[in-house]
């Protein structure tokens, strides 16, 4: 079955049951997510606006899916497996009486079960498991997942252990204003631009002339040197970093545990052994992966490759290619492509190069 292909997952409480105080609902849902984050590498973050991965809804009767609720008793709630749109969403029947205790239906216990489904778990045949299909009140102060629940969720996401530290080769710092300077990877991170080269990265804060050089290992000790591609999904505070056939996920500037993972989990064919460059376009919610003289397009919402790819870079990005070293997205309409010591500002709306620059032009050289 499906799983979330990321470890940083957002949720939003769409509306609140009148049966409980809002703070108690928030607390019950937060604690329910925590039950699962305690035993996996997953991290859950509540957002109040925008599109969350998991939408928590209180509704009665027909409520926009095929599975209308049935009044008091019977079906208490249901949740959809990981995916885009309705995927992951958890619906609670408003005709139940939701509580913080043993009276009525305990929201925390029901939410733990439903979030299990939201994360990809099916029902368990173990009566002690929270994923057993029938509701039974247990003391929430001493509540624990059963061994079967833990086994199930860790088979999908692994355990919460950190990765082992990876060594870095010893490269000397490149000269920033060398006219022949090229970069391995470039990406935005919020209002900053990270330029990767060997075991170093330069940090450029938008509109400020000052830049600083850093060792990759000083910021992210578990990451290797020689990052080959990078992209950011700013709305999720995520940065993906690639080297060889592996990738790492950085959430809120912290490496997620249980990485690296194989690039083939994105859906690349086996002959793809490394990514040259990658860029996410928030307008289309697509990531473009550049490999040799071709590129793939990946739908970040549906978490699958778009059909019809790969395509030739030269055919669809006029004046760019046949291969590129790095690329990043900026100012809502430009890709900046890096090829050796040259850089091309490319307007993706007009579909043409609007400026040719040196790769290190961002540093006032």
């Amino acid at each position: 079955g499906p799983v979330w292909r990321k470890h940083y997952i957002t949720y939003r409480i769409n509306n609140y049951t009148p049966d409980m105080n809002r703070e108690d609902v928030d607390y019950a849902i937060r604690k329910a997510f925590q039950v699962w984050s305690n035993v996996t590498p997953l991290k859950f973050s509540k957002i109040n606006t925008g599109m969350a991965d998991i939408l928590v809804v209180f509704a009665r009767g027909a409520h926009g899916d095929f599975h209308a609720f049935d009044g008091k008793g019977g079906i208490l709630a249901h949740a959809f497996g990981p995916g885009s749109g309705i995927g992951g969403d958890a619906h609670f029947d408003e005709d139940e009486f939701w509580t913080t205790h043993s009276g009525g239906t305990n929201l925390f216990l029901t939410a733990v079960h439903e979030i299990g489904h939201s994360l990809g778990l099916g029902h368990s045949s173990d009566p002690k498991a929270v994923m057993f299909p029938t509701y039974k009140y247990v003391d929430i102060n001493t509540f624990r997942l059963s061994a079967d629940d833990i086994r199930g969720i860790q088979s999908l996401y692994g355990d919460p252990k950190e990765n082992q530290r990876l060594p870095n080769p010893d490269n000397s710092e490149p000269a920033l204003c060398d006219p022949n300077l090229s970069f391995d990877a470039v990406t935005t991170v919020g209002n900053k631009i990270f330029f990767f080269k060997d075991r170093f990265f330069w940090l450029k804060v938008s509109e400020r002339p000052k830049t600083s050089v850093n060792l990759i290992s000083s910021l992210w000790p578990t990451l290797p040197s020689g990052i080959e591609a990078a992209y950011e999904i700013e709305a999720r505070n995520q940065v993906f970093l690639f080297k060889d056939d592996k990738y790492w996920l950085i959430s809120n500037l912290r490496p997620e545990p249980n990485y690296p993972k194989s690039i083939h989990s994105f859906g690349f064919p086996n002959f793809v052994k490394k990514i040259d460059a990658a860029v996410f376009n928030p307008r289309f919610y697509r990531t473009y992966f550049f490999v040799d003289n071709q590129y793939w397009r990946y739908d970040e919402r549906r978490q699958m490759m778009d059909p019809g790819y790969p395509k030739l870079i030269t055919k669809n990005f006029q004046g760019i290619g046949p291969k590129i070293d790095a690329v990043f997205y900026s100012k809502n309409k430009y890709y900046y492509f890096f090829q050796g010591s040259n850089q091309f500002e490319y307007d993706f709306l007009l579909q043409r190069i609007t400026k040719t620059l040196k790769s290190n032009s961002w540093f006032g050289c």
Partner: antibody, heavy 122, light 103 residues
Framework: EVQLLESGGGLVQPGGSLRLSCAAS????????MHWVRQAPGKGLEWVSG????????MYADSVKGRFTISRDNSKNTLYLQMNSLRAEDTAVYYC???????????????WGRGTLVTVSS | DIQMTQSPSSLSASVGDRVTITCRAS??????LNWYQQKPGKAPKLLIY???SLQSGVPSRFSGSGSGTDFTLTISSLQPEDFATYYC?????FGQGTKLEIK
């Protein structure tokens, strides 16, 4: 490439029966919810029926409940619609459509077949 | 049961025009709304899912918005191939369709 190919349509008299099939390829059929949607000549789309990946859960529009039966054979990658007690108002092009993976249906029809025409007339 | 009301039922426009079609649910369906395009003699094609997410391979001139009960499908600059019938849908309920014709 995902492909859905309906067959079994044709002309049938009121009160008669017909069985439609939908052969699926290009995806793991047993992971997905599947549905039938119909369209009467010159009219809009009408959802008819849906079935869960295992076949354990089925759903029907009120207009066909008790007359139509949806089923699937995951070993053959095939979806079926058994239509009994057919009426003139069942005349339509019948499409099979793929939904999402998982325990519940989203009603998100991302791939459709080309349709098969069922005509109920005396 | 939830009802879906789509408007207008037909619409004439020219190539290059910006066109908006609306769909209203009789009660909240959150963002659980999809839009389809259908051309004569063809199967419907998914354009937008979850109210605003563009389906793979669909041109970016198509966009969707809304949540709760009110939703819109917008085509920013009509192309000749966009003249078709458009349907909104949630679960087992389709809107009655909007036929988009050349002016």
């Amino acid at each position: 490439e995902v492909q859905l190919l309906e067959s079994g349509g044709g002309l049938v008299q009121p009160g008669g029966s017909l069985r439609l099939s939908c052969a699926a390829s290009g995806f793991t059929f047993s992971d997905y919810w599947m549905h039938w949607v119909r369209q009467a000549p010159g009219k809009g789309l009408e959802w008819v029926s849906g079935i869960s990946p295992s076949g354990g859960m089925t759903m029907y529009a009120d207009s066909v409940k008790g007359r139509f039966t949806i089923s699937r054979d995951n070993s053959k990658n095939t979806l079926y619609l058994q239509m009994n007690s057919l009426r003139a108002e069942d005349t339509a092009v019948y499409y099979c459509a793929r939904d999402i993976v998982g325990p519940y249906s989203a009603g998100l029809f991302d791939y459709w077949g080309r349709g098969t025409l069922v005509t109920v007339s005396s | 049961d939830i009802q879906m009301t789509q408007s207008p039922s037909s619409l004439s426009a020219s190539v290059g025009d910006r066109v908006t079609i609306t769909c209203r649910a009789s009660q909240s369906i959150y963002t659980y709304l999809n839009w389809y395009q259908q051309k004569p003699g063809k199967a419907p094609k998914l354009l937008i899912y979850a109210a605003s997410s563009l389906q793979s391979g669909v041109p970016s001139r198509f966009s969707g918005s809304g949540s709760g009960t009110d939703f819109t499908l917008t085509i920013s600059s009509l192309q000749p191939e966009d003249f078709a019938t458009y349907y909104c849908q949630q679960a087992g309920i389709f809107g009655q369709g909007t036929k988009l014709e050349i002016k």
